[in-house]
Interface confidence: medium
């Protein structure tokens, strides 16, 4: 009686069970009654991860410079290629896909947390008694400078995007 | 051949849920995200939501009560179900590979809520 | 989720002109901008991914530029299948609770 399910790594076809081919082979032709499965090797830039019945091995992933990818690792007959960001991008998706410039903080922003290979620079705006009046992608909300340490007065109170500003304190003549 | 198929039932009544099947071919959907995409009848694109290569879901703040966005890697299959249905969810839906950068859409199939 | 706002909504133009849509970004999403044509009864069609870099077989007719919130799309010297209607989309992504995208209104390129 012809099986109605097979073994791991095995697949039916005309009422019988065929080994299924391994990772980083394709298949070329079915088991017979008489012939086992007929498997390749992927050519050079293909892949298969699985056991399988593929006819075609997938391409490797081309991590291409103009979407600012480099190889983080190259791929071999049974994995993909792995893509990552060149230095100063970071990717735009989990399976970075392309990559976009680090994004920098405005005035007014101060940087929370520095971008890394796979997340954004991280922005946070500058509470009160900080500011930042650059576009950065590293520079932090800086503390507005202390006028009664230098022994001066505020005359212009500071933002979140300015500095306060000192001036002598006015003395009765 | 790499490609993107949407299908599913063309006429679903309202506060029905909503289901769609997108099956990819000639890559693989680990190495790749894939999001969903929806255009009203005679108007602009809405972006639904996606699943990144590593499983991750990302909604658009409209579609976060209502939607679920899978993946079934061995079927080569992405999923989307939109809850609750009305009228208003009338459109054509889309399948794309990518982000933002989506390099390659389905036809997409056209879905009318309707008693 | 990120406002993206297209303009013009309409674009009536001869072929041979030049032709130009912005978009506007509701924050600062550095490059990650794409734009689409679309024709009709047809999915869209990606042309410029990040801002400025052409897609395969996009022709060079078709330029992109900008970054952070400001960003344009010219078509140098407009031709008969270029009357279509074009969308930009676009977003970032740190985390799975920290991102956003979005899609332009959309910009309907009509013959004069």
């Known amino acids: 009686e012809p099986p109605t399910a097979c073994r791991e790594k095995q697949y039916l076809i005309n009422s019988q069970c065929c080994s299924l081919c391994q990772p980083g082979q394709k298949l070329v032709s079915d088991c017979t009654e008489f012939t086992e499965t007929e498997c390749l090797p992927c050519g050079e830039s293909e892949f298969l991860d699985t056991w399988n019945r593929e006819t075609h091995c997938h391409q490797h992933k081309y991590c291409d410079p103009n979407l600012g990818l480099r190889v983080q690792q190259k791929g071999t007959s049974e994995t993909d290629t792995i893509c990552t960001c060149e230095e100063g991008w970071h990717c735009t998706s989990e399976a970075c896909e392309s990559c976009v410039l680090h994004r920098s903080c405005s005035p007014g922003f101060g940087v929370k947390q520095i971008a890394t290979g796979v997340s954004d620079t991280i922005c946070e705006p500058c509470p009160v008694g900080f500011f930042s009046n650059v576009s950065s992608a590293f520079e932090k909300c800086h503390p507005w400078t202390s006028c009664e340490t230098k022994d001066l007065v505020v005359q212009q109170a500071g933002t979140n995007k300015t500095d306060v500003v000192c001036g002598p304190q006015d003395r009765l003549r | 051949q790499v490609q993107v198929q949407e299908s599913g039932p063309g006429l679903v009544k309202p506060s029905d849920t909503l289901s769609l099947t997108c099956t990819v071919s000639?890559?693989?959907?680990?190495?790749?995200?894939m999001s969903w995409i929806r255009q009203p009848p005679g108007k602009g694109l809405e972006w639904i939501g996606a699943?990144?290569?590593?499983?991750?879901?990302y909604y658009a703040s409209w579609a976060k009560s209502r939607v679920t966005i899978s993946v079934d890697t061995s079927l080569n299959q992405v999923s989307l179900k939109l809850s609750s249905v009305t009228a208003a969810d009338t459109a054509v839906y889309y399948c794309a590979r990518g982000w933002t950068r989506l390099d390659l859409w389905g036809q997409g199939t056209l879905v009318t809520v309707s008693s | 989720d990120i406002q993206l706002t297209q303009s013009p909504s309409f674009l009536s133009a001869s072929v041979g002109d030049r032709v130009t849509i912005t978009c506007q970004a509701s924050?600062?999403?550095?490059?990650?901008l794409a734009w689409y044509q679309q024709k009709p009864g047809k999915p869209p069609k990606l042309l410029i991914f990040?801002?400025?870099n052409l897609a395969s077989g996009v022709p060079s007719r078709f330029s992109g530029s900008g970054s952070g919130t400001e960003f344009t799309l010219t078509i140098s010297s407009l031709q008969p299948e270029d009357f279509a209607t074009y969308y930009c989309?676009?977003?970032?992504?740190?985390?799975?609770?920290?991102f956003g995208q979005g899609f332009g209104g959309g910009t309907k390129v009509e013959i004069k």
């Open positions: 000639g890559f693989s959907l680990s190495s790749y995200d």
């Open positions: 989309q676009g977003g970032y992504w740190t985390s799975t609770s920290n």
């Open positions: 924050e600062d999403i550095s490059s990650n």
């Open positions: 990040p801002a400025s």
């Open positions: 699943i990144g290569g590593a499983g991750g879901t």
